[in-house]
């Protein structure tokens, strides 16, 4: 483990500071981690990492003159599971062919860059659950149709918060199994079109906090378990509760919205088929009692994956077999915002 210009320890290579002006061609091909920090790289050239069969992580951080990532930079790397590209404000262009054939990819971070479009992930084809973390890219304005097709054969988490997203097209999430979608802090985002989740499974968790979104789509929220819409002042109405059959936790802006969930009873037709199996009924009742009260989403400031990155999903949620829905909702109605005012009497309604 030795290199003339990059620091290394145990096959981890750190190429650091202004003396690094290009990706060294003589980095050992058995490296397991490569980090390029505070360098003067202007271009990451085609095939820069080809042949790194053991490479697990790449970090490209605080490279203020980086402008271009060419084709085939992150391609055909069988063990690569983490890519971090951050704090590169002059990075304006990532070639659509930059990311290809990364069967073990689990985490892709692109933050604080100048890119104008979401990276093309169609050819990544990961066999793992993927967290795509694209934050603080203020020049990204649009999410096009089919933006995430081909990212993973498994489920995906999309953290698209704090960008400049203003428009999301119908079918944007087509072809994805969407565990979580975070669109928070896209301050100019006003609309989620009705067919935005067409062709997608999920989302299970949706965060639209601190956006200007005024309504949720009518379709595609059947699997939604957690909704977070803090400081989303334009969101004045929610879809009918029949569209939110799986909802368990809601963290909203107005206390009045929580009133809708009080004593809401799910229709038998909405229950999961497994609930009809009489053999399971007793076990289901026992399990739902044993699991007790859930913690409030309002207290859950960080997303479920940010603490660790254990991508395994939970077992079947037997709470779905309860006819009476216990939706944990905040902010709770109080003396100043009582449910009676809006829900209590027909004349007031």
């Amino acid at each position: 483990c030795h290199h003339r210009i990059c620091h290394c320890s145990n096959r981890v290579f750190l190429c650091q500071e202004s003396k690094v002006t290009e990706i060294p061609s003589d980095l050992p091909r058995n490296a397991i981690e490569l980090r390029f920090v505070l360098t003067k790289l202007r271009v990451i050239q085609k095939g820069a990492f080809s042949g790194f069969g053991d490479l697990e992580k790449i970090e490209i951080s605080q490279n203020d003159v980086l402008e271009v990532i060419e084709a085939d930079v992150f391609s055909n790397l069988p063990k690569l599971h983490e890519i971090r590209i951050e704090k590169a404000n002059n990075l304006l262009y990532i070639n659509p062919e930059a990311f290809q054939n990364l069967p073990n990819l689990q985490y892709l971070l692109i933050s604080n860059t100048g890119i104008k479009h979401l990276p093309d992930v169609h050819k990544i084809h990961s066999l793992q659950k993927v967290l795509l973390d694209i934050q603080d890219n203020i020049n990204i304005h649009t999410i096009e149709r089919n933006s995430f097709v081909g990212l993973s054969f498994e489920s995906v988490i999309l953290w698209l918060n704090k960008n400049g997203i203003q428009e999301i097209h119908n079918c944007a999430f087509n072809g994805t199994q969407l565990d979580e979608l975070n669109l928070s802090d896209n301050n100019n985002l006003e609309e989620l079109p009705n067919d935005v989740f067409h062709g997608a499974s999920g989302p299970v968790i949706l965060d639209i906090s601190r956006t200007r979104i005024h309504s949720l789509p009518s379709y595609g929220l059947e699997n939604l378990k957690k909704l977070r819409a803090r400081s989303t002042y334009n969101l004045k109405k929610l879809p009918t509760l029949e569209k939110l059959v799986a909802l368990m936790e809601a963290s909203l802006t107005y206390p009045s919205h929580c009133c809708a969930f009080a004593n809401w009873r799910r229709q038998i037709s909405e229950l999961h088929p497994i609930c009809n199996k009489s053999i399971l009924r007793q076990e289901v009742d026992y399990m739902t009692q044993a699991r007790g009260q859930r913690s409030s989403l309002a207290e859950d400031n960080e997303s479920s994956y940010s603490r660790g990155f254990d991508m395994t999903y939970t077992e079947f949620d037997y709470d779905l077999c309860n006819e009476v829905v216990d939706v944990t909702c905040s902010p709770k109605p109080d003396a100043f915002n009582p449910c009676e005012d809006i829900m209590g009497y027909n004349i007031l309604r």
Partner: antibody
């Protein structure tokens, strides 16, 4: 084979000046990643980094010594110099010339050293 | 400046003994997952020789009985089975930031 040979040491009075030379071979200071510098060791004491220069002429000094010590290099002769001014008794030490690799900032090869004695 | 403190200052040991020398930095010498900590051996009247770099990486040609470990502020040099030629003074050194600094040294003597 890398070799570093120091010269120019000797006895000098307090306030005086001295110029040390290090003739190196087996590597080129024009090669990316190469550096050469000085480390000193007072008699019976520990080691102290003095200064070094990288292949791109980037010079780094120990802040405690920078005002009095100056590095220069003659690439055609593969020779590093350390000009020492306003010498003090506490500058008495063996001065080692070292080859430094930018990767891990490794002191890969050392000369045998030259003794500088500052005394009246 | 980052201060480097070694312990013990000296120790007596016999051939075949396992010897450990500690080095503590006044602040972390890690940067982006790499520890900028080196170990040197110096024999009387000779220049120091690099043994270990980046805390745990053995320089080529150094006997395998020498190993390094640690991260952050606490580091250890271990000689698994002391040999007669290992009686010397050992120094740790940080190169995370200028000025690069050395420990005061640990002298390993024959018991």
């Amino acid at each position: 084979e890398v070799q570093l040979v120091e010269s120019g040491g000797g006895l000098v009075q307090p306030g005086g000046s001295l110029r040390l030379s290090c003739s190196f071979s087996g590597f080129s200071l024009s090669t990316s990643g190469m550096g050469v510098g000085w480390i000193r060791q007072a008699p019976g004491k520990g080691l102290e980094w003095v200064a070094h220069i990288w292949w791109d002429d980037d010079k780094r000094y120990n802040p405690a010594l920078k005002s009095r010590f100056t590095l220069s290099v003659d690439r055609s002769k593969n020779t590093l110099y350390l000009q020492m001014n306003s010498l003090r008794a506490e500058d008495t030490a063996t001065y080692y010339c070292v080859q430094i690799n930018y990767g891990n900032y490794r002191f890969d090869n050392w000369g045998h050293g030259t003794l500088v004695t500052v005394s009246s | 400046d980052i201060q480097m403190t070694q312990s013990p200052s000296s120790l007596s040991a016999s051939v075949g003994d396992r010897v450990t020398i500690s080095c503590r930095a006044s602040e972390s010498v890690d940067n982006y997952g790499i520890s900028f900590l080196n170990w040197f051996q110096q024999k009387p009247g000779k220049a120091p020789k690099l043994l270990i770099y980046a805390a745990s990486n053995q320089r080529s040609g150094v006997p395998s009985r020498f190993s390094g470990s640690g991260s952050g502020t606490d580091f250890t040099l271990t000689i698994s089975s002391l040999q007669p030629e290992d009686f010397a003074t050992y120094f740790c050194q940080q190169s995370k930031e200028v000025p690069w600094t050395f420990g005061q040294g640990t002298k390993v003597e024959i018991k």
